[in-house]
């Protein structure tokens, strides 16, 4: 047990210790999206509130231009909820000539962009057919998981149809990440 | 490297370190709700099991009277799932005189109460139209995100209709929080 | 205050400190399921990718034979999303002889197996009636919560119908856990 006397109770530590309150963290909340042109086959990215109300970024986790910027490498828990709302989907016409329609759908993707990498990486996807009958509809898609990220990685949330996103309340549509 | 010999591997720490096992944590599970009077335009709060089965509270995180009491300030991850179940919604009558009905809906809200603040704050909301066809229905709403809370804050889970909550199994409907 | 001079800023620690990067963690992603025999009244377990793409296990958290093996006791956050997809449910025939059908459903269960315990424990369940009209359908079920686990516990994800699981993309169906 030689030498143990100077290593009080944390002698099993091999990586540097750090205070939890010092870790990069962000919780972003929905804002009304500004009218922007987007390409037909590309899901548009949402932009977010980062300082008003429930929203915050801290400890070098910065938000800029639709992206959360990862300030240090490590394992992060990343989450988002997007609440969608719409008027009756045409799918509710039920069947044309006896065969089912291709369903309408709503999709959320949390995407990682690494500058040194040509293609974005889809980390998480929530996708749901929407085939509502007889009314307005609304529903959330929630996603959350842990990923190993590198310093400089950028995270964004893409949706299948920006016009269906419920932007009315900060508790309905949000996006966050924190270093574990 | 002068002085480094006494600061083994954690010299970058500016805030106090603390053992993870010492952090406030709770996972609460559903119990059958007792009939209580609640105001018409106010979503009723659920009450919870806090010590039997999978449920626990630890490290000064206490549960009392439908509330989780936050024992120290910091960033918390808060989550809940509520499983709803019901008989066919009237919405499935589809169209009356050619126009759709207002949809039935199910909603979960995680709410923060701060004694020094007159109004509760809605932290998270999951809301879904329910317009089911031809059968009994059941479905979960899941929520989870990170929030900066203050010592003394109280958390509760409110639902749009307490009679639709599935209270039969502890793994279907639950509520939890932990200090990051 | 005798002896305090050698306990710089973390004197409130009662449990051993440990570096966050050293904690057991895993994120597993979907693979195409091999046909396996399972008992009629028992939900089959999914098997997973543990090292390719976004998947990883680290710090003694091992994956073997459909199970995540817990290497040390503590509080873990456990999560999974399963995306289901199917053809129109018979439920869409709406009513037979004037009474509703028993709904089709999709269910995900995260289960804990403790060798010293005869019965598996269901930690989390997400279950949803599926009563779609007029089309193919697809939708995710997400689950996540914190549990106190013991060294040697095993975790698995069970589903109601393995043939409905969308195994096409690693971001659609996944399973993970990390020590808090």
């Amino acid at each position: 047990l030689k030498g143990q006397e100077f290593a009080p109770s944390h002698q099993q530590v091999y990586a540097p210790l750090r205070a939890d309150g010092d870790k990069p963290r962000a919780h972003l909340t929905v804002v009304r999206q500004t009218p922007t042109q987007h390409f037909k086959n590309q899901f548009p990215a949402l932009h977010w509130e980062h300082e008003l109300g429930l929203a915050f970024t801290k400890n070098r986790m910065n938000y800029t231009n639709k992206f959360l910027l990862i300030p240090e490498s490590g394992d992060y828990f990343i989450y988002s909820q997007v609440t969608f709302r719409g008027m009756t989907s045409e799918c509710s016409e039920i069947r044309q000539a006896g065969r089912p329609n291709k369903p309408d759908s709503i999709t959320v993707v949390i995407t990682k962009v690494t500058d040194s990498y040509p293609e974005p990486t889809q980390l998480l996807m929530g996708t749901k057919s929407v085939c509502e009958v007889g009314s307005n509809w609304f529903q959330p898609i929630y996603l959350g998981a842990m990923f190993s990220l590198q310093e400089g990685d950028k995270l964004m949330v893409n949706v299948s149809d920006i016009s269906l996103v419920d932007y009315t309340k900060e508790d309905k549509t949000f996006f966050g990440a924190f270093l574990l | 490297l002068k002085g480094q010999e006494f600061a083994p591997s954690h010299q970058q720490v500016y805030a106090p370190l603390r053992a993870d096992g010492d952090k406030p944590r709770a996972h609460l599970t559903v119990v059958r709700q007792t009939p209580t009077q609640h105001f018409k335009n106010q979503f009723p709060a659920l009450h919870w099991e806090h010590e039997l089965g999978l449920a626990f509270t630890k490290n000064r995180m206490n549960y009392t009277n439908k509330f989780l009491l936050i024992p120290e300030s910091g960033d918390y991850f808060i989550y809940s799932q509520v499983t709803f179940r019901g008989m066919t919604s009237e919405c499935s009558e589809i169209r009356q005189a050619g126009r759709p009905n207002k949809p039935d809906s199910i909603t979960v809200v995680i709410t923060k109460v701060t004694d020094s603040y007159p109004e509760p704050t809605q932290l998270l909301m999951g809301t879904k139209s329910v317009c089911e066809v031809g059968s009994n229905w059941f479905q979960p709403i899941y929520l989870g995100a990170m929030f900066s809370l203050q010592e003394g804050d109280k958390l509760m889970v409110n639902v749009s209709d307490i009679s639709l909550v599935d209270y039969t199994k502890e793994d279907k409907t639950f509520f939890g929080a932990f200090l990051l | 205050l005798k002896g305090q001079e050698f306990a710089p800023s973390h004197q409130q620690v009662y449990a051993p400190l440990r570096a966050d990067g050293d904690k057991p963690r895993a994120h597993l992603t979907v693979v195409r399921q091999t046909p396996t025999q399972h008992f009629k009244n028992q939900f089959p377990a999914l098997h997973w990718e543990h090292e390719l793409g976004l998947a990883f296990t680290k710090n003694r958290m091992n994956y073997t034979n459909k199970f995540l093996l817990i290497p040390e006791s503590g509080d873990y956050f456990i999560y999974s999303q399963v995306t289901f997809r199917g053809m129109t449910s018979e439920c869409s025939e709406i009513r037979q002889a004037g009474r509703p059908n028993k709904p089709d459903s999709i269910t995900v269960v995260i289960t804990k197996v403790t060798d010293s315990y005869p019965e598996p424990t269901q930690l989390l369940m997400g279950t949803k009636s599926v009563c779609e009209v007029g089309s193919n359908w697809f939708q995710p079920i997400y689950l996540g919560a914190m549990f106190s686990l013991q060294e040697g516990d095993k975790l698995m994800v069970n589903v109601s119908d393995i043939s409905l699981v969308d195994y096409t993309k690693e971001d659609k169906t996944f399973f993970g856990a990390f020590l808090l």
Partner: antibody, heavy 119, light 111 residues
Framework: QVQLVQSGAEVKKPGASVKVSCKAS????????INWVRQAPGQGLEWMGW????????GYAQKFQGRVTMTADRSTSTAYMELSSLRSEDTAVYYC????????????WGQGTLVTVSS | QSVLTQPPSVSGAPGQRVTISCTSS?????????VHWYQQLPGTAPKLLIE???NRPSGVPDRFSGSKSGTSASLTITGLLPEDEGDYYC??????????FGGGTKLTVLG
């Protein structure tokens, strides 16, 4: 009751700017987005953009981007729309309108402000 | 660029029923918030008549109703009155979240 009261008529020269105000009362100003819509003489309605009085966030129609600025003064519950580099075809009645959050329909309208651009 | 198309004019005698259509050039029109209808009487600001295809704000008579079929929305006025004479506009949002108005329809009450 909800009221939106706009500033009076303006006559401007081409190239100048105009700033129209819209004073809200009868509700919590910061809780509802304000839109601006214009109507040229004998023509239809044309949407210009929206303003969130709480955050100051805005969204402008492509046609007006770079020329329009929408702002709010929360202390006086007043929204403003400034249009620069005026030309004769900007002659119109300019309306502010409060939105219904759920549907983004324009539920309450100001009485309108006539802006004439003439040399 | 999406367009909402309305007939330039419609007319009807008092007591009759008229319908004004609003057709979208794109399938996603109104997907999120629906189609709204406004009435503009001569010399006044527009007034919301129907929101979200079907819903009448309080104070709007039930002679006014909205409907939807495919990529078209319609406003129907039954029991036409002389004071209904004016311009009617449909409005929605396109996929870029820009608000769009139809060109307007002039309603004339005959006789």
């Amino acid at each position: 009751q909800v009221q939106l009261v706009q500033s009076g008529a303006e006559v401007k020269k081409p190239g100048a700017s105009v700033k129209v105000s819209c004073k809200a009362s009868g509700y919590t100003f910061t809780s509802y987005d304000i839109n601006w819509v214009r109507q040229a003489p004998g023509q239809g309605l044309e949407w210009m953009g929206w303003l969130n009085p709480n955050s100051g966030n805005t969204g402008y129609a492509q046609k007006f981007q770079g020329r329009v600025t929408m702002t709010a003064d929360r202390s006086t519950s007043t929204a403003y729309m400034e249009l620069s580099s005026l030309r004769s075809e900007d002659t119109a009645v300019y309306y502010c309108a409060r939105e219904v959050p759920e549907t983004a329909a324009f539920e309450y309208w100001g009485q309108g402000t006539l802006v004439t651009v003439s040399s | 660029q999406s367009v909402l198309t309305q007939p330039p004019s419609v007319s009807g005698a008092p007591g009759q029923r008229v319908t004004i259509s609003c057709t979208s050039s794109s399938s996603d029109i109104g997907a999120g918030q629906g189609v709204h209808w406004y009435q503009q009487l001569p010399g006044t600001a527009p007034k919301l008549l129907i929101e979200g295809y079907y819903n009448r704000p309080s104070g709007v008579p039930d002679r006014f109703s909205g409907s939807k079929s495919g990529t078209s929305a319609s406003l129907t006025i039954t029991g036409l009155l002389p004071e209904d004479e004016g311009d009617y506009y449909c409005q929605s949002y396109d996929g870029t979240l820009s608000a769009l108005f139809g060109g307007g329809t002039k309603l004339t009450v005959l006789g």
